[in-house]
Each structure stands twice: as structure tokens, then as C-alpha cells.
């Protein structure tokens, strides 16, 4: 009676041993095939064969400028991307037979896709717009108006808006307000008026001094008596000290677009880039 | 076969103009940019100008930024280098050339362009 | 600006390797293409992508392209080896050549 099962038990081992169940699932880097499991090509190497009863897989290496980056069955390999330097394109990394090809843009060009299959120029912001957040790679420049109290003179991909130059804490004053796009214009306190004024006083005096000499000669008569000795009318100097030219501080002026600018004592005598412009 | 046959070289005075063509066959036009590279009498390679297949990018080398401009006509598979403002320094042998992989694998058979007064 | 520089002449005696180089700033991490120009003839690409041999080129033709420099070897040179050969490669989207290497088969 215990027989018969156990030779039911030996001929279903032996069964099985002559025609093993086929596999549903391989292991971890191999691949099922007439149902049997065969090894997976490493990366950089491509499927030429697939392996039998007898033989293993059989793989090639990829050949120049091609990859496979994972543990495959590919018959071929795949072709390293070109960073086309005619659509602003260079190589960031050189690609192997296991990597590909990484491109990024010449500097100045960004990404216009997350693949960086093409790049564009870097936008720059025009004037009265400041660089918010400057490009990257893979980003535009981003741009903001110049709020009050700033301005932006160039078209550029990099300058912020500058703040107005403070004429206060040079001890000057506006003479012209700035907007987004030109700073303002400092100059020296009361300076319209000094012009005016100066010459005219220098006019003034100059007609007294004529009135008086004139007086002087014309008015006065000849007289006998003369308890002193006779003066000879005095030769008028004008002496280089008259008011409004004050020799402990000299005053440079420099013609700046027709105007006369008054240029302060100890400071140098430079215009500024915005001026120059 | 594949080949690149150029003309429009000859003998020109400084400050003139001359253009040069390179008709292409044997291969899509349109799928390849181009290249012309020149070379003066005795001297070197030097590369001169490129333009992207579908004629949308170009760029020059610096000193002909503004003098010599690149263009093709994809319909009629030829490429052409307007040359303006001559100078004695252009001087060479001109080829045209296609782009193939960071290099240039199919080269006219050059023309010649001098300038002199 | 960025330069290629190449020896100005090379001599090798026929059947020997001949190996011309080509430097420049990191040039490793660009791809070199190398040209073979004879007299009164137009350039022929013989290397392209540091490595790579176009259809017709001998096997005698090889490249490779490392740190700064870059090298074409001629393997078994031959006397119709003897020309000038000239290093390619690109930099912020312009292609630059190397100044020419005259190779003299004794």
C-alpha cells in the first residue's frame, strides 16, 4: 500500500528533474527567453545573441559615440546626443558608452527646454527695466520696472535699477528731478542765482567807481589855498580780491552742455558717467 | 556623389564687393549647416562663417563681423558668402564646407579671391 | 580668445608612428576633428569626435583627446601620409584650427 505512492513521489521527481517547470520571473539582471532566463548586457554593451541551453548571452560593446545606460536586451545602441554649436549649443559632458552626451548653452544662451535640445539669448531688460533675476542656463533674465527713486540708463541682461543719486548728502541740490531712466542731476546750492547775480553786482560797482571818478574830476574846482600839498589823483587799482572772487576757496568751472558748472573746492573735477552720456 | 562645387572668386579693388556660391548635391542640403573656411596664400586654416540648416543662425569670425554675410537657399541647395567692404587681408582661398559632428566632412574645391588695388 | 596650438613640423621615417599634437585649455572637454590637406588640394576630414575614422579613412588613422591635449597618430606611416595636418574643435559656438603641422615622411 506504501508503494504506489512513493513510486508516484520518485517518478514525479524524476519528471520534474527531465522537464523542469519554465520560469514566470527571472532573477535581478537577467530577462526570460524560450523559456529560459538569460543574462542582460551590461551597460555599454548591446544583445547580439541570446543565450541557450548551452551558450551564455552574448554582448558587444557599444561602438564610438554610442551608450546604453542600463542593464539591457537592446540590439542597438543609442546615439550620443549632438550639442549642435549652431543652435548655441557646447558639450557640458562628453558621453561614454554607458552615459550620454550632457549639452548646455554658450554662456549668454539659455535652455529652451528641459532637454536642452536648443538655446536662445539671455533677454536683457531695456531701459527703465532692471534685472530682477538674472539668467541661468536653463532660465530668462527676469525684469522689473524701475520703481520711484530708481533708474535704469542701459539695455542689459545683468544691471539692477540704480537708486537716484542723494544731492543732499553731497550738499548739493537738484536741478534736474530724476525718472526710470536717467538719474538725477545734482548741482551746487544757488548756483543760477550766483551766475546772475555776480556779474551784475561786478557791473554795478564798476558804474559807481566811473560815477565817483567822474565826479571827482568834473566837481571839483581848483583852489589857491592849499595848507597841504596838492595829491595827485590816485590811480584806481582793481585788486584781484574784489567780492565774489574769494582766493581762499578758487572756483574751477567747467563747461558742461553751454552751462557753466561750478566746481567746489576739494573735490575732484570729475563728471560722472551719467553726465557724460 | 556627394559634392560641393563653388564659384564667384576673382580679382577685386579694396572697399568692393564680390559674392561667392557653393552648390551642393549628392545629400538633403536642408539638413545640414554650413561652413566656409578660408585660407590665405601660404598660411593656415581659418574658419570664417557658419549657418544653421534652416538658415536661422548664423555667426562669423570677429574681424569679418559686419563685412561678410552667410546665407543659403534651401530650395536651390546652394550656400553663398556676400562679401562686402573688401581689405587686402581677405585675401585666400575660400571653401565651402559641411558641418558633420563638431567637424566639417565634405569641402568645396575653393575659390580664389583677391583684393588689390 | 581661445587658441589651438599645434608643432609646426613633425618627421617620421616610413613605417613608423607619427603623432602630432593639439593644445589648447581644456580641450579634453571639447570634441577635437583633425584635417589632412596636400598641396593645391582641399581639406580632408580624417578624425572627427576626438576618435572617430570617416568611411574611406585607413585604420592607420587614429585620435584621442585628453586633459589639454589632444593626438593624431598615424600608425605605419606612409609616404602619402606627407601633408599638413590641421586640429579643429569649438569654442562659444566658433569652430577654430590649430596653426597646421607640416608631416615630412623622410
Known amino acids: 500500500m506504501v508503494r504506489l505512492p512513493l513510486q508516484c513521489v520518485l517518478w514525479g521527481c524524476l519528471l520534474t528533474a527531465v522537464h523542469p517547470e519554465p520560469p514566470t520571473a527571472c532573477r535581478e539582471k537577467q530577462y526570460l527567453i524560450n523559456s529560459q532566463c538569460c543574462s542582460l548586457c551590461q551597460p555599454g554593451q548591446k544583445l547580439v545573441s541570446d543565450c541557450t541551453e548551452f551558450t551564455e548571452t552574448e554582448c558587444l560593446p557599444c561602438g564610438e559615440s554610442e551608450f546604453l545606460d542600463t542593464w539591457n536586451r537592446e540590439t542597438h545602441c543609442h546615439q550620443h546626443k549632438y550639442c549642435d554649436p549652431n543652435l548655441g549649443l557646447r558639450v557640458q559632458q562628453k558621453g561614454t558608452s554607458e552615459t550620454d552626451t550632457i549639452c548646455t548653452c554658450e554662456e549668454g544662451w539659455h535652455c529652451t527646454s528641459e532637454a536642452c535640445e536648443s538655446c536662445v539669448l539671455h533677454r536683457s531688460c531695456s531701459p527703465g527695466f532692471g534685472v530682477k533675476q538674472i539668467a541661468t542656463g536653463v532660465s530668462d533674465t527676469i525684469c522689473e520696472p524701475c520703481p520711484v527713486g530708481f533708474f535704469s540708463n542701459v539695455s542689459s541682461a545683468f544691471e539692477k535699477c540704480h537708486p537716484w543719486t542723494s544731492c543732499e548728502t553731497k550738499d548739493l541740490v537738484v536741478q534736474q528731478a530724476g525718472t526710470n531712466k536717467t538719474d538725477v542731476v545734482c548741482g551746487p546750492q544757488d548756483r543760477l542765482r550766483a551766475l546772475v547775480v555776480i556779474p551784475i553786482i561786478f557791473g554795478i560797482l564798476f558804474a559807481i567807481l566811473l560815477v565817483l571818478v567822474f565826479i571827482k574830476k568834473v566837481a571839483k574846482k581848483p583852489t589857491n589855498k592849499a595848507p597841504h600839498p596838492k595829491q595827485e589823483p590816485q590811480e584806481i587799482n582793481f585788486p584781484d580780491d574784489l567780492p565774489g572772487s574769494n582766493t581762499a576757496a578758487p572756483v574751477q568751472e567747467t563747461l558742461h552742455g553751454c552751462q557753466p558748472v561750478t566746481q567746489e573746492d576739494g573735490k575732484e573735477s570729475r563728471i560722472s558717467v551719467q553726465e557724460r552720456q | 556623389q556627394v559634392q560641393l562645387v563653388q564659384s564667384g572668386g576673382g580679382v577685386v579693388q579694396p572697399g568692393r564687393s564680390l559674392r561667392l556660391s557653393c552648390a551642393a548635391s549628392?545629400?538633403?542640403?536642408?539638413?545640414?549647416?554650413m561652413h566656409w573656411v578660408r585660407q590665405a596664400p601660404g598660411k593656415g586654416l581659418e574658419w570664417v562663417a557658419v549657418i544653421s540648416k534652416d538658415g536661422s543662425y548664423e555667426n562669423y569670425v570677429d574681424s569679418v563681423k559686419g563685412r561678410l554675410a552667410i546665407s543659403r537657399d534651401n530650395s536651390k541647395n546652394t550656400l553663398f558668402l556676400q562679401m562686402d567692404s573688401l581689405r587686402p587681408e581677405d585675401t585666400a582661398l575660400y571653401f565651402c564646407?559641411?558641418?558633420?559632428?563638431?567637424?566639417?566632412?565634405?569641402w568645396g574645391q575653393g575659390t580664389t579671391v583677391t583684393v588689390s588695388s | 580668445s581661445y587658441e589651438l596650438t599645434q608643432p609646426p613640423s613633425v618627421s617620421v621615417s616610413p613605417g613608423q608612428t607619427a603623432s602630432i599634437t593639439c593644445s589648447g585649455d581644456k580641450l579634453g572637454n571639447k570634441y577635437a576633428s583633425w584635417y589632412q590637406q596636400k598641396p593645391g588640394q582641399s581639406p580632408v576630414l580624417v578624425i572627427f569626435?576626438?576618435?572617430r575614422r570617416p568611411s574611406g579613412i585607413p585604420e592607420r588613422f587614429s585620435g584621442s583627446n585628453s586633459g589639454n591635449t589632444a593626438t593624431l597618430t598615424i600608425s605605419g606611416t606612409q609616404a602619402m601620409d606627407e601633408a599638413d595636418y590641421y586640429c579643429q574643435a569649438w569654442d562659444s559656438s566658433t569652430a577654430l584650427f590649430g596653426g597646421g603641422t607640416k608631416l615630412t615622411v623622410l
Open positions: 549628392g545629400f538633403t542640403f536642408s539638413s545640414y549647416a
Open positions: 569626435q576626438d576618435s
Open positions: 564646407a559641411r558641418d558633420y559632428w563638431y567637424g566639417m566632412d565634405v
